[in-house]
């Protein structure tokens, strides 16, 4: 189970994980106390058939080729949470683990 | 956390789970002893922004709009395994739980 890692200088056209730092203040999400920014990453690239396909299911659907099924697309296949401190709508300070905030791996599904 | 369910008569254009029965024999996967067929399901449809987006990450990447990032796509967000009896490469009969063979829910990610 693996995925490609790329950066802005990469010439890779296939499905790959790219670095992306999210700055909450730039979005007006100033009500997030910490972290103010974090490494989110994102997925981009082409999904040639078979390349980085995570599940047998993806192959099977491609083989069956039902009406309306698109080819697989480059999407997070492994994500992790981050701990955040923020104000909710009632002005209470909340500390919580927010799931699926960081892309750890990209694949075709 | 929910997803739409559709069938072949549906007029829904948005991301939806459709029924699909996989027949292993039809694919030439004769080495699978049981089941010979199973309900796999698949995802298809459009991902308008916000609709069925599973993670905050999807919103953040869309807003940051980095180079090469595509819009979210309709993909499995919940999958389940099936138990299978099959011949491995050494002609041994194996009974095992094969992960991510059934799509339980579709979403935009």
């Amino acid at each position: 189970d693996f995925g490609l890692d790329c950066d802005e200088h990469s010439t890779e056209s296939r499905c790959c994980r790219y670095p992306l730092t999210v700055d909450f203040e730039a979005f007006g999400w100033d009500w997030i106390i910490a972290p103010k920014r974090y490494k989110a990453n994102y997925c981009s690239g082409e999904c040639e058939f078979v390349f980085l396909q995570k599940y047998p299911h993806t192959h099977l659907v491609h083989q069956a080729n039902p009406r309306g099924s698109a080819g697989p697309c480059c999407t997070p296949t492994k994500m992790s949470p981050i701990n955040m401190l923020y104000f909710n709508g009632k002005e209470q300070i909340i500390y919580g683990k927010i799931p699926a905030m960081v892309v750890d791996r990209c694949g075709c599904s | 956390d929910f997803g739409l369910d559709c069938d072949e008569h549906s007029t829904e254009s948005r991301c939806c789970r459709y029924p699909l029965t996989v027949d292993f024999e039809a694919f030439g996967w004769d080495w699978i002893i049981a089941p010979k067929r199973y309900k796999a399901n698949y995802c298809s449809g459009e991902c308008e922004f916000v609709f069925l987006q599973k993670y905050p990450h999807t919103h953040l990447v869309h807003q940051a709009n980095p180079r090469g990032s595509a819009g979210p796509c309709c993909t499995p967000t919940k999958m389940s395994p099936i138990n299978m009896l099959y011949f491995n490469g050494k002609e041994q009969i194996i009974y095992g739980k094969i992960p991510a063979m059934v799509v339980d829910r579709c979403g935009c990610s």
């Epitope: 203040e25 730039a26 007006g28 999400w29 100033d30 002005e91 | 916000v50």
Partner: antibody, heavy 119, light 107 residues
Framework: EVQLVESGGGLVKPGGSLRLSCAAS????????MNWVRQAPGKGLEWVSS????????YYADSVKGRFTISRDNAKNSLYLQMNSLRAEDTTVYYC????????????WGQGTTVTVSS | DIQMTQSPSSLSASVGDRVTITCRAS??????LGWYQQKPGKAPKRLIY???SLQSGVPSRFSGSGSGTEFTLTISSLQPEDFATYYC?????????FGQGTKVEIK
């Protein structure tokens, strides 16, 4: 109770200056972006300017760019709008509004302060 | 800049009527839109955020829908206190832009 109270409005001659203030209470002011929005008599709402929590991101409407300056003092829970080179068309009620940003927008507004530009 | 076109500019309705106000964005703004109610001499009050989420404390007769470029505010059964002017606001990008407003008057 979350509250915003504007002050500093009044009568000023064309070409003159005025400084509006907005006092915030009931919430952690330093953790929110803030806006100024205005409304001419009998007219619609017009966004004027925004400032992020640490003043890193500042935006202006074209109609006020180069004449108005938005600022904030988080220690004093205060938002300001320095208005220079005032014109007759700047005659409006000015509101300050708290902003929860992308996806959420402006959720809390002050009662407004009136600025009249007339000779 | 994103233009917000609101319609109608005014409407006359009776108590109990279902009222629909629309807002069209000149380019896609996802669901980054709020609806505000304003009464004469008062500050605007937010009714709906993120196109369809009801602001806490706002009666459930108000609802919002839409995404992309077409948005709707619906009042399912107009009450006497609902006679006011309604504005949409896009908070997708800067400059922030409001619709021209819809004045809801008593028939």
């Amino acid at each position: 109770e979350v509250q915003l109270v504007e002050s500093g409005g009044g009568l000023v001659k064309p070409g003159g200056s005025l400084r509006l203030s907005c006092a915030a209470s009931g919430f952690t002011f330093s953790s929110y972006s803030m806006n100024w929005v205005r409304q001419a008599p009998g007219k619609g709402l017009e966004w004027v300017s925004s400032i992020s929590s640490s003043s890193s991101y500042i935006y202006y409407a074209d109609s006020v760019k180069g004449r108005f300056t938005i600022s904030r003092d988080n220690a004093k829970n205060s938002l300001y709008l320095q208005m220079n080179s005032l014109r007759a068309e700047d005659t409006t009620v000015y509101y300050c509004a708290r902003d929860r940003g992308y996806l959420y927008g402006m959720d809390v507004w002050g009662q407004g302060t009136t600025v009249t530009v007339s000779s | 800049d994103i233009q917000m076109t609101q319609s109608p500019s005014s409407l006359s309705a009776s108590v109990g009527d279902r009222v629909t106000i629309t807002c069209r964005a000149s380019q896609a703004i996802r669901n980054d839109l709020g609806w505000y109610q304003q009464k004469p001499g008062k500050a605007p009050k937010r009714l709906i955020y993120a196109a369809s989420s009801l602001q806490s404390g706002v009666p459930s007769r108000f609802s919002g829908s839409g995404s992309g470029t077409e948005f709707t505010l619906t009042i399912s059964s107009l009450q006497p206190e609902d006679f006011a002017t309604y504005y949409c606001l896009q908070h997708n990008s800067y400059p922030r832009t409001f619709g021209q407003g819809t004045k809801v008057e008593i028939k």
